[in-house]
Interface confidence: medium
């Protein structure tokens, strides 16, 4: 039997030291932050990388990871000879298992794998494997890069010295040296059969906290065919607490992976906290922005002939994997909230990463259903205006779906934002459906073990006087063409309303596959083909917040953890340095710019040229080496939200007329100083409906689940 713990995300950690075997038993201990001092963090948003530094001071250090490795400036280190691997050629035992930590997918190694050489101070034992990936279609997902080139996936193997410590966790907690290997996965036409056990495992840990045993695999087969060409540098954990204790070995050559196999990574879910609401989202882009090298020197191995046979295109294509086939990451922080009895406000934030700037405008699409009839409307909103729209003449008995897409030059589009559902007059919470692999809910209720984790909990924010249901589902952050053959009428109305009796609220992050096929012409410019809806029966669900939980270990506190939110920006940037960086003059070499706003500042925009840097010890000048990806604040208002309603006094309640959209002028604070999301409840005068409910998760609530049992052999995901 699998024992699940579904944690409010602020109660779980995701850094490399977080997941380890309890030496006195077989349980995995997820340490609680109150006891350990580990703050909640995320890869984007208000808890994103630029904010890690405020609660994990080491994240602001100067020897941080990941980095971009410029081959021409890496010096050959004669001490970096052949790696000695021991045990890597053995098949893994059936006790090796995989876990979705919510921040990554980790493989807990139960066999003895040792590495020595490569300048490591001793013989190090492999503890675990973690993965980092992008969002779709082989987009950049690696943390490290070589000559500016990033890869779709990076696998990291973490090691500790068992002669010095009895466990990996002890080494971390005592701030002692650990080792890490970084292995890049690159897209190839064919499946890599060596990855099959991993891919199969991924399908068993789709949801946060899921665990599964892995079929036997050979760890050596997950490494590049040639191990002779590698880079070495001293850095840090790439997740909080960002301890600067890692001896990194970064392999030059990638491991092949097919698009089909990549999809298993893109299908992983996590839970995120947004303004007290727990939402289920795809776990994507789980990489830390790159950090500056500062006074460090990157070395390369001195293994004879190992550097002579690298693929020419690898060296000649500095950009490598395109950041995306779309012009930016999706608009984020989608919110739908009622302004009064007949109007809704949709708000969002600008994308965190813009691959092909600038954003010209945003397409806001919304559909609604009434009496099985389906309607849709799309309109544009200039990107330099406040990123919110008012939908007036809202019908209380219609179900509304909203999503936003950024539009760049040449009609290039971003990925779609998460899709928000809203309906007033709710009578019960939508929590009984199953989400199948395509993201289309089936009408049949799921068993309790397979309940989609979409209920946000049972506490009600009564102080607002505005009760509505906010229920969370998976994000539809697919490619910009991710329309589907399913229609809102057929899927949403019949499935959700008829099949489930869903009556209201906003469902955050509805799957994009539920969006209607008939998107307006303006909103369907992407040339990519829509993927067919495959109604598989594999549930991507995990128990809801009230799932089984084990007792807290040793009475460790499980309260909300440390979040030292001192930085102005709430949009964690992806591919730029935020907290470990200094200065803000330079662009990333790939031409990526970043829209997320940081603190008030009037620095010039980044320019391609960058100051020369002299490497310590080498005395050679390295032109433009240190990419500084520090967020440069903009005058855009994209980061701002929670403006006053700005209501139209002439709005008329109507259940017959389709809603109209109006742009809303923001009358708030300095546009250069984006505010954090306001937690302030709306006034009673703005309330939408007395019989709606706003389901939230109270951050102060305790989660008494301190341990998670390892999966029993009899029950595989």
């Amino acid at each position: 039997v699998l024992h699940y713990v579904v944690c409010f995300p602020a109660l779980t950690e995701g850094y490399v030291g977080a997941l380890h075997e309890n030496r006195h038993g077989s349980a995995v201990q997820i340490r609680r932050r109150k006891a350990s001092g580990d703050p909640y963090w995320a890869y984007s948003g208000a808890y994103g990388p630029e904010h890690w530094v405020t609660s994990s001071v080491s994240c602001g250090g100067r020897h941080q990871s990941p980095i971009d490795i410029l081959d021409q400036y890496a010096r050959v280190g004669e001490e970096y000879q052949e790696l000695q691997l021991d045990g890597f050629d053995n098949e893994s035992s059936n006790k090796t298992w995989m876990k979705n930590t919510g921040k990554t997918v980790a493989i807990l190694l139960k066999d003895d794998y040792f590495v020595s050489g490569a300048g490591l101070p001793g013989r190090f034992k492999a503890e675990k494997v973690e993965f980092h990936w992008g969002h779709s279609n082989g987009s950049a997902g690696s943390e490290h890069s070589i000559n500016g080139r990033r890869f779709p996936v990076e696998m990291q193997i973490f090691f500790y010295n068992p002669d010095d410590f009895d466990s990996f966790q002890t080494a971390i907690s005592e701030n002692r040296i650990i080792g890490a290997m970084a292995i890049f996965f690159q897209v190839s036409p064919r499946d890599n059969s060596a990855l099959d056990p991993i891919i199969h495992g991924l399908k068993g840990v789709v949801h946060h906290e899921k665990e599964t045993f892995l079929d036997p695999f050979v760890l050596r087969d997950l490494l590049p065919a040639s191990l002779g060409s590698y880079y070495r540098y001293t850095g840090s954990l790439t997740t909080p607490p960002c301890s600067e204790i890692v001896e990194w070995i970064v392999f030059r050559r990638p491991v092949p992976i097919s698009y089909h196999q990549l999809e298993a990574f893109y299908s992983i879910f996590t839970t995120e906290q947004q303004d007290h609401v727990k939402s289920v989202e795809y776990l994507r882009n789980n990489f830390r922005p790159q950090q500056r090298l500062h006074d460090r020197v990157v070395s390369k191995s001195a293994v004879r002939d190992s550097w002579n046979h690298d693929m020419t295109d690898f060296l000649e294509n500095p950009l490598g994997t395109e950041a995306s086939k779309v012009c930016s990451s999706p608009p984020i922080h989608m919110k739908v909230q009622p302004l009064n009895q007949t109007a809704l406000q949709v708000s969002w934030s600008q994308p965190e990463t813009i691959y092909h700037p600038p954003i010209m405008n945003y397409m806001i699409s919304y559909s609604w259903t009434k009496n099985e009839d389906e309607k849709e409307k799309t309109f544009t909103k200039d990107s330099d205006k406040d990123l919110k729209a008012t939908i007036s003449h809202v019908s209380p008995d219609s179900l509304y779906l909203f999503r936003v897409q950024a539009v760049c030059r040449n009609d290039m589009r971003s990925d779609f934002s998460q899709t928000m559902l809203f309906q007033a007059n709710t009578t019960r919470i939508f929590q009984g459906t199953r989400i199948v692999k395509t993201g289309v809910p089936t009408a049949s209720p799921a068993s309790s073990a397979d309940m989609a984790p979409i209920s946000s909990g049972s506490s009600t924010w009564t102080s607002s006087g505005i009760p509505f249901s906010f229920v969370s589902m998976a994000t539809g952050m697919g490619p910009s063409s991710s329309g589907s053959q399913a229609t809102v009428a057929s899927v949403v109305t019949s499935t959700l309303l008829a099949g489930l009796g869903f009556g209201g609220g906003g469902i955050s992050s509805f799957p994009s596959t539920v969006w209607p096929t008939r998107l307006p012409t303006a909103a369907s410019a992407s040339k990519q083909a829509a993927r067919p809806v495959l109604a598989t029966t594999e549930a991507l669900a995990s128990p809801g917040p009230d799932g089984d939980s084990s007792p807290t270990k040793d009475g460790e506190g499980t309260e909300e953890g440390e979040k030292d939110e001192k930085s102005e920006s709430e949009d964690g940037e992806r591919e730029h340095e935020e907290d470990g960086e200094k200065d803000s003059e330079k662009k990333e070499k790939s031409g990526v710019t970043h829209a997320a706003e940081e603190r008030n500042q009037t620095e010039p925009s980044p320019t391609p040229s960058s100051p020369n840097r002299t490497a310590e010890g080498g005395h050679q000048t390295i032109p433009g080496h240190e990419q500084d990806h520090t967020a440069v604040p903009t005058d855009q208002t994209g980061g701002r939200r929670d403006a006053g309603p700005g209501l139209d006094p002439d709005m008329v309640t109507s259940t017959q007329v389709p809603p109209t959209a109006t742009e809303e002028q923001y009358a708030g604070s300095d546009p250069k100083r984006p505010e954090m999301p306001s937690k302030k409840p709306m006034s009673r005068g703005d309330r939408f409906s007395e019989d709606s409910r706003f389901i939230t998760v109270n951050p102060a609530e305790k989660n008494t689940s301190g341990m998670i049992s390892r999966p029993a052999p009899g029950r595989m995901e």
């Epitope: 602020a10 405020t54 994990s56 607490p241 979040k563 200094k582 603190r599 008030n600 505010e675």
Partner: antibody
Framework: QSLEESGGRLVTPGTPLTLTCTVS????????MSWVRQAPGKGLEWIGT?????YTYYASWAKGRFTVSKTSTTVDLKITSPTTEDTATYFC??????????WGPGTLVTISS | SFVLTQPASVQVNLGQTVSLTCTAD??????ASWYQQKPGQAPVLLIY???SRPSGVPDRFSGSSSGNTATLTISGAQAGDEADYYC?????????????FGGGTQLTVTG
């Protein structure tokens, strides 16, 4: 967005005193707040910080002498047993780790017998 | 404990350039911020993250960092720049977080 300290007054040594920083325009659940003091003619001295979740950090010299707490819109600094050395102007500040340009005007505390 | 050292006072002629320094062991691993404080007022942030300048701060103020020394440079000093200047940084990690101010430098603008 604004901060304002209050509660500063003249008290005798040993009499507990609580200062309050009232914030508006941003959420304390998303921001860390710090208390800094400045004795007359002296430099700035960090006392402690409370983060978005209510976790507290103190200067080594301040532990046990000061307590930082908060409500939804206020951050309090309790001087548990003031001495004359605690006479100072007390400031609250937001986002001090990387540098804060959100400071209150300060409130003067005088400890005298 | 972590100590930031600043010169107690510095003089500069009107219109000249002056550099205020702040040193500490391992400052190279920390970010420095700089504050200006005039009598009876709260500190005003001039520089954060070693080199970044908030909006509203004149570009006459610039920050730099080299090794274990952070420097605030004021070019074209004006009478209104006469004030106390404090450098600051954070030290430690996690629960042992400590924030430290330097002792301050009193800048006098002459002429």
């Amino acid at each position: 967005q604004s901060l304002e300290e209050s509660g500063g007054r003249l008290v005798t040594p040993g009499t507990p005193l609580t200062l309050t920083c009232t914030v508006s325009g941003f959420s304390l659940s998303s921001n860390a707040m710090s208390w800094v003091r400045q004795a007359p003619g002296k430099g700035l001295e960090w006392i402690g910080t409370i983060d978005g979740y209510g976790y507290t950090y103190y200067a080594s010299w301040a532990k046990g002498r000061f307590t930082v707490s908060k409500t939804s819109t206020t951050v309090d600094l309790k001087i548990t047993s003031p001495t004359t050395e605690d006479t100072a102007t007390y400031f609250c500040a937001r986002e001090i780790y990387l540098g804060s340009n959100f400071w209150g005007p300060g409130t003067l505390v005088t400890i005298s017998s | 404990s972590f100590v930031l050292t600043q010169p107690a006072s510095v003089q500069v002629n009107l219109g000249q350039t002056v550099s205020l320094t702040c040193t500490a062991d391992t400052l190279s691993r920390r970010y420095a911020s700089w504050y200006q404080q005039k009598p009876g007022q709260a500190p005003v942030l001039l520089i954060y993250r070693d080199t970044s300048r908030p909006s509203g701060v004149p570009d006459r103020f610039s920050g730099s960092s080299s090794g274990n020394t952070a420097t605030l440079t004021i070019s074209g000093a004006q009478a209104g720049d006469e004030a106390d200047y404090y450098c600051a940084t954070a030290d430690g990690s996690g629960s042992s977080y400590q924030f430290v101010f330097g002792g301050g430098t009193q800048l006098t603008v002459t002429g």
